[in-house]
């Protein structure tokens, strides 16, 4: 059938979703593309419980999530409403800081070393997390 009952190899199951944690770094757009090619998306954090789960797996390492404001307002990549949804920004973030000298502001969100969120330059090569819903992650066996 087309519905998965468990996550693929190297993916971690949690609350009806499957998560994949990178061990290398990519720019936000390249990380987003990587997840899309897996029929997944950069992780969308919808609760404190999910925040703690992801934080536990990534450790104290800057890691991209599926949140950006490259087109104006902050948006989650799967369409989850930002304004009414869960948020875990560091104090005084996001600040769209221009002082980094790399051109432009800061349009992509990441987990910081303490798990709270910061906006940063999207070209920075951070680790990333992909997420896909369990019932969407299924692969029926090849027809022989």
């Amino acid at each position: 059938g087309s519905e998965r009952t468990c996550c693929p190899v190297n993916w971690v199951e949690h609350e009806r979703s499957c998560y994949w944690f990178s061990r290398s770094g990519k720019a936000w757009a390249d990380a987003d593309n990587y997840c899309r090619l897996e029929d997944a998306h950069l992780v969308v954090v919808t609760s404190w419980e999910e925040q703690k789960f992801v934080q536990h797996h990534i450790g104290p390492v800057n890691t991209w999530m599926g949140l950006h404001d490259q087109n104006g307002p902050w948006k989650w990549v799967d369409g989850t409403d930002y304004e009414t949804g869960f948020k875990n920004w560091r104090p005084e973030q996001p600040d769209d800081w221009y002082g980094h000298g790399l051109g432009g502001g800061e349009d992509c969100a990441h987990f910081t070393d303490d798990g709270r969120w910061n906006d940063d330059v999207c070209q920075r090569p951070y680790r990333w997390v992909c997420e896909t819903e369990l019932d969407k992650a299924s692969q029926e066996p090849p027809l022989l």
Epitope: G1, P8, V9, W11, C18, R36, D39, A40, T132, Q139
Partner: nanobody, 116 residues
């Protein structure tokens, strides 16, 4: 055996249009989300667009949003990509794909060349 066969590629001038098709067989087409991905010369794979199994939910890369339209006909087991306002940077081999986390199926691809 899963098979995905793309067609409709070719040479087109900037600003022109093409419609790609992908004939699917060997699996229950209507039960799966389907995607288009592309690979430009000398570049890596780029996700272009995906469509839900019923055709009512679509997703697009920012680079093609507003120019490309993905659709499907489950009665014909066929996936489509309507490409308008084509640009030189759209030149690539386009693949129809049944993407799944941890396991993918791909077609052989169809070449789209945008040049004056």
């Amino acid at each position: 055996e899963v098979q995905l066969l793309e067609s409709g590629g070719g040479l087109v001038r900037p600003g022109g249009s093409l419609r790609l098709s992908c004939a699917a067989s060997g699996f229950t087409f209507s039960a799966y989300r389907m995607s288009w991905v592309r690979q430009a010369p000398g570049k890596g794979l780029e996700w272009v667009s995906s469509i839900g199994k019923d055709g009512n939910v679509t997703y697009y890369a920012d680079s093609v949003k507003g120019r490309f339209t993905i659709s499907r006909d489950n009665s014909k087991n066929t996936l489509y990509l309507q490409m308008n306002s084509l640009r030189a940077e759209d030149t690539a081999v386009y693949y129809c794909a049944k993407l799944r986390a941890g396991f993918d199926y791909w077609g052989q691809g169809t070449l789209v060349t945008v040049s004056s």
